[in-house]
Each structure stands twice: as C-alpha cells, then as structure tokens.
C-alpha cells in the first residue's frame, strides 16, 4: 500500500503557499488529483513528489496516490484546502448528468473546513430548493441530491456564510436523465 | 463536540501485558485517523502509534521503540480505539493520551497513566 | 529518522512581552509542523498546524513561520493564560517526532 507525506488526512494552507505531496511505493506509484494548475511532477523509482510553490484555491481536493502493480488494489490520499477567503468553492465540473433515482453528486469543494457550518445548497438566482430535495453535503466531496427526480435538472449554486454574508459557487446544471 | 476518553491505565510488572481503551464522540470516527502518544518526564512528548481510517486500509505504524510489543487496533461499530502492549519495561511508564489526527493532533483525551515497576 | 530540536527549554518572561520559540527539523520537512501547548497538569492542545496556520480558536498574538528544516513560534503581548509548555512536531512520515519542550515561566 503506498504512504503519502505529509502524513495527515487533511492539509490547509493558504494561498500562494509551497504544497509538496510525496508518495512512497514498493513499486513505481501515480497521482490523481483535480485538474487544477501550478502542480509540477517528479518520479524517481517508487516515489513521486506532487509540488506547487503557487497553490491557489483551485488546488483544492482529494490527491490519491496508487500503486498500478498492486494486486490488491490500495491506495493512499490526502485532502488539500487552499483557504481562500475570497474563493470558498472550487467548482471541479460543470455540468452533472445522472439517471432518474441515482445520486447526483455537484461537485464544489469547500475551500476552508472552517465554512463547513454555514453552507447551503441553493438553486440559481437564489431561488429554494425543490420541496422534497434529500441532499447532504461533504466538504471533501460536494452536495450530493439523493435519488435525483428528472423534476430536480435545474441550476444551483453552492452557498457558504463568510462573515455574514452569502458567496455562491459558479453555477452546476443538473440533468436527471429519465429511465427508459 | 469532539470527545476522546482513555481507560485501562494502572500498575503493572515489568514484562506483563496491559491493554488502553479510547472511547471517542461527537465526529465520524470511522473516517479518522487515531494515535496514541505517551507523555513521561524523561522522554518529553513521544508518539507511539497510529490506525489509519478504513478508506486508507486500516494501515498501522508504529515507533521503533515499541514495535513488536505494542498492537493498535480499532473497533469502528464501537468508535474506539486500543492499544494493546506487552513485555512491558519500565521505560514505558507514562502518561498516554488518545489523539484524532486531521491536520495535526486535532483533539487529545485526558490521558491515562501506566506505571510498569516492580 | 526526522529529530526535531526546539530552543529553548526554557524561558522566564513577563507578561505583555514578546517572545520567539524555534524548531529546527533534522531534514527538510516542506513546513509540515505543528505547535501544541500543554498548561500544567492538562493534554497538549493543537496551535498551529502546516506550520504557518492558526487552529480554530487560537488568539490572534500567536503565529508560526518558517520552511525548509527551521521554524519558529511567536507570540506576541504575553497574556497570563500563555504561561505552560510548547511543543513542536513534523508530521512528514513517521515517525511523528516532537521537540523536547521549551517551558513558558512568569518572571
């Protein structure tokens, strides 16, 4: 199973920080992360160093490091908040597509864990949610709608309280694809 | 709120066996990574052991002064952690508190005290 | 394995005054430091983690700098409640060394 350092589920830094990611393998070992930019990559054997001396909000979310001639499978990631106080989302699609009673995942990511109170899902315009709207939300992950409705493709926009006041994501359409 | 509460400390002879329990609430202890970490005049702060959350394996490391004799372990339906530790030397005495690691060691329980003497 | 070297052991200040705690890793630790404070008789509390970055709740006068293998612990305006221990500890691998301590005395 490949080790990341540093060797903390969670790391926050703060915008223009240096990020340096190392994975460690038996064998030669791969990142995946979210596109984002800034990142340089350097692979020697079995280790690999993930770095940015630049990190911005965008650098935001989950890394996961793996090891291809595992048999087993495992893997190692660490989750990275770039704490922007002017970005609290990093938005990594779109546009979601789902069939009618799958979870839709949106996917914005918190950008500061300490927002993780205040946060709402809302639709575009700040218009509310659809009654019945079964939602929940992970800062590593986004806002997932439970059992998506064909009725629920719609636009929303990722809310979060900072200093009072509500900051939206970009906007994310939702298309709940009916079951033929 | 976060709450990590240690038992099973005492008095133990030099070579037995002791187990430490942690009981922990108010977050998903499922999803967290768990330590422990003794405290004792002589050597200051010094980390002992860690359990990694299921999604990294339940991959466990340990400090080389214990290796071989200590065993961490974690009961997720139960959100407790262990740490079970045999052939026992003086040296060991200490206090040992529980810790959750998020970005550092987030929160500590209140410690409990093993004495390993004759 | 990483060995971490805090200066001083100890320090006997006053309050109100400004004082500075170092930490020096025995390798690059890419500022993959915490800072813990430990009053008498209670369980180290997180201050400062990624080296730079203030925990929840942590008052404004302390801040952390440093990169590479050398780091340091500032605070600013001594208050009463600062008094105690502080301790530092790399999280780059394991295992996850400490400092030896450096005491906070009223003078």
């Known amino acids: 199973i490949p080790v990341i350092e540093p060797s903390v589920p969670e790391l926050v830094v703060k915008p223009g920080a240096t990020v340096t990611l190392r994975c460690v393998g038996n064998g030669s070992v791969e990142w995946d992360g979210p596109p984002s930019p800034h990142w340089t990559l350097y692979s020697d054997g079995s280790s690999s160093i993930l770095s940015t001396n630049n990190a911005t909000f965008q650098n935001t979310g989950t890394y996961r490091c793996t090891e291809p001639g595992d048999p087993l499978g495992g893997s190692a990631a660490i989750h990275l908040y770039v704490k922007d106080p002017a970005r609290p989302w990093n938005v990594l699609a779109q546009e979601v597509v789902v069939f009618e009673d799958q979870d839709a995942l949106l996917p914005c990511l918190l950008t500061d864990p300490v927002l993780e109170a205040g946060v709402s899902l809302v639709r575009v315009r700040g218009r509310p949610l659809m009654r019945h709207t079964n939602y929940s939300f992970s800062p590593w992950h986004g806002f997932t709608i439970h059992r998506a409705k064909f009725i629920q493709s719609q636009d929303y926009q990722c809310s979060a309280l900072m200093g009072g006041r509500k900051v939206m994501s970009i906007s994310i359409r939702l298309k709940v694809q009916k079951v033929i | 709120e976060v709450k990590l509460e240690e038992s099973g400390g005492g008095l133990v002879q030099p070579g037995g066996s002791m187990k430490l329990s942690c009981a922990a609430s108010?977050?998903?202890?499922?999803?967290?990574?768990m330590d422990w970490v003794r405290q004792s005049p002589e050597m200051g702060l010094e980390w002992v052991a860690e359990?990694?959350?299921?999604?990294?394996?339940?991959?466990?490391f340990y400090a080389e002064s214990v290796k071989g004799r200590f065993t961490i372990s974690r009961d997720d339906s139960k959100s407790s952690v262990y740490l079970q530790m045999n052939s026992l030397r003086p040296e060991d005495t200490g206090i040992y508190y529980c810790?959750?690691?998020?970005?550092?060691?987030?929160?500590w329980g209140q410690g409990t005290t093993l004495t390993v003497s004759s | 394995d990483i060995q971490m070297t805090q200066s001083p052991a100890s320090l006997s200040v006053s309050v109100g005054e400004t004082v500075t705690i170092t930490c020096r890793a025995s390798?690059?630790?890419?500022?993959?430091l915490a800072w813990y404070q430990q009053k008498q008789g209670k369980s180290p509390q997180l201050l400062v983690h990624?080296?730079?970055n203030l925990a929840d709740g942590v008052p404004s006068r302390f801040s952390g700098s440093g990169s590479g293998t050398q780091y340091s612990l500032k605070i600013n305006s001594l208050q009463s409640e600062d008094f105690g221990s502080y301790y530092c500890?790399?999280?780059?691998?394991?295992?996850?060394?400490f400092g030896g301590g450096t005491k906070l005395e009223i003078k």
């Open positions: 990624a080296a730079t």
């Open positions: 359990i990694r959350s299921k999604a990294n394996n339940h991959a466990t």
């Open positions: 108010g977050f998903t202890f499922s999803d967290a990574w």
């Open positions: 810790t959750r690691v998020k970005v550092g060691f987030d929160n």
């Open positions: 390798e690059n630790i890419y500022s993959n």
């Open positions: 500890q790399h999280f780059w691998g394991t295992p996850r060394t």
